[in-house]
Each structure stands twice: as structure tokens, then as C-alpha cells.
């Protein structure tokens, strides 16, 4: 699916993981995910 591509989040910086459609920056400790990011390597909405 999608041809040859890296099977990991290829985003600048750490703490990105695949959530839904995109690799998103994860939530800080003590926070939870309200909504995933809406662009590749974007920021999740955390509470």
C-alpha cells in the first residue's frame, strides 16, 4: 500500500506517532488525547 515508504513517523522532533490518518505529536504526561492532528506531523489536541 503506497509503494516504498518508511514504516515510521518521519517528522522533525520526537514524540510523534501514527494516530488516525497522520503522524501526530503525542500528548504530554498527565494529558489525554481529545482529537488527533489534521495534517502530517501536526499537533494533537490534548486535555
Amino acid at each position: 500500500q503506497g509503494g516504498t515508504r518508511s514504516p515510521r513517523c518521519d517528522c522533525a522532533g520526537d514524540f510523534h506517532k501514527k494516530i488516525g490518518l497522520f503522524c501526530c505529536r503525542g500528548c504530554p504526561a498527565g494529558h489525554y488525547l481529545k482529537a488527533p492532528c489534521t495534517e502530517p506531523c501536526g499537533n494533537s489536541t490534548c486535555l
Partner: antibody, heavy 123, light 111 residues
């Protein structure tokens, strides 16, 4: 051969509800993100919903948020779109679309489209 | 939302000549060196069909007379030489950010 067959369209009064279905075959449905895209009578294309593979996160534009719900049944290779509080501007042909991912971090193109099902909202 | 403006709205080209359709985004659709822009063809009575992805990659099975180019916010689709079978509507679409958006379409006709 990839096939996407929509059903469930029809005539509905403003404020009414409708549930569209899309039967998928010819590919491993569970591994693909899927979308619904509609085309107005004026031929304008508008993306209205998407669901990711695996974790089934859902995404909508503001214009349908709270009114439309996309879901999938991977066991039955079927995609759904539940529409409520329908308005005249929701009148369109609704296409079921497969989303091919070209980058793991999230780049998608709509590489296969069904023939569409027509929805008319009118009193 | 990223707005895509296509031009011209309609285009009449002689058989064998070149057709060029433009698409301008309200902001860049680049992501780490990839232009997240697609082109689709829609013939009368049919659903859209993917022609070009990532601005310049031709989808499998699409004739070589179709090509795409561009970067940042400015993109174009070229058809050369134009054939009768190319009579259709053409749409650009961005995948840089949700909501995915489409251009208003360009109708290609034969002169």
C-alpha cells in the same frame, strides 16, 4: 479489480435523515482509509467525511460536523455515512472513495471512486 | 481552509495541441519536500479518476500525454497532445491539511 458500490440515496425532506452504504471489493478494505466526497448539481466537489484504517478515527469539515457520521464494518467490507438534519444544500451525488497513502506520516490521494448515489433534499 | 483556485474555468483546444490548466492554493501545500497536490479527470456521467499525485507523479494506467508540475502554492496540469478522449472536467485537490479541498474545475473542450 477494485470496486466500490454505493447505495441508500434518494429523496428526503429537509430535516430528514438518510444512511448511505458502500460495498467494497477487490482489495483489503481494512487496511485503507476511506472517504465520502459529494458533487453538487453545479459539479463542485466537496469532501464530507473520512475514516482511518485500524483505529477508525473520523474527520469532517465544519459544514457537516454534528450532522454526518462516517463508520466502517471491516468484517463486511462496508463503509457507511449517516446523515441527519439534512438541508437543501446537501443535495448532491455522494461518492465512496478509497484513500491511498503514499507517506506513512500522512499523505493521501483518492485513487478509486464508486459510481455514486444521488441524494436530493427537497420538500 | 486551503482554497484552491483553478483557471481557466473552461478551455477549448485543437486536437494535437497543448492544454494547460492552473491551480493556485491559498498557501503552500508542501510537506517535507513533497507537494501534496492531486489532479483528477471526470468524464460526463462518470466519477472522478486520479491522474496525478504528489504534483507530478502519473498514476498507473494514465497516458503519458498527461503531466503535472509545480510547487509551493502554484501547480499546473498539461495535456499534450490533446485527444478527443480528453474531453472532461479536471479538478485539483490538496491533501496538505484537513479539510481536503478541491478546485472549482476546468472544462476542457475541443476547438
Amino acid at each position: 479489480e477494485v470496486q466500490l458500490v454505493e447505495s441508500g440515496g434518494g429523496l428526503v425532506e429537509p430535516g430528514g435523515s438518510l444512511k448511505l452504504s458502500c460495498a467494497a471489493s477487490g482489495f483489503t478494505f481494512s487496511t485503507y482509509a476511506m472517504s465520502w466526497v459529494r458533487q453538487s448539481p453545479e459539479k463542485r466537489l466537496e469532501w464530507v467525511a473520512e475514516i482511518s484504517s485500524g483505529d477508525s478515527y473520523t474527520y469532517y469539515p465544519d459544514i457537516v460536523t454534528g450532522r454526518f457520521t462516517i463508520s466502517r464494518d471491516d468484517a463486511k467490507n462496508t463503509l457507511f455515512l449517516e446523515m441527519s438534519s439534512l438541508r437543501s444544500e446537501d443535495t448532491a451525488i455522494y461518492y465512496c472513495v478509497r484513500d491511498q497513502d503514499y507517506r506513512y506520516d500522512g499523505y493521501y490521494a483518492m485513487d478509486h471512486w464508486g459510481q455514486g448515489t444521488s441524494v436530493t433534499v427537497s420538500s | 481552509d486551503i482554497v484552491l483556485t483553478q483557471s481557466p474555468a473552461s478551455l477549448a483546444v485543437s486536437l494535437g495541441q497543448r492544454a494547460t490548466i492552473s491551480c493556485r492554493a491559498s498557501e503552500s501545500v508542501e510537506h517535507y519536500g513533497t507537494s501534496l497536490m492531486q489532479w483528477y479527470q471526470q468524464k460526463p456521467g462518470q466519477p472522478p479518476k486520479l491522474l496525478i499525485y504528489a504534483a507530478s507523479n502519473v498514476e498507473s494506467g494514465v497516458p503519458a500525454r498527461f503531466s503535472g508540475r509545480g510547487s509551493g502554492p502554484d501547480f499546473s496540469l498539461n495535456i499534450h497532445p490533446v485527444e478527443e478522449d480528453d474531453i472532461a472536467m479536471y479538478f485539483c485537490q490538496q491533501s496538505r491539511r484537513i479539510p481536503w479541498t478541491f478546485g472549482g474545475g476546468t472544462k476542457l473542450e475541443i476547438k
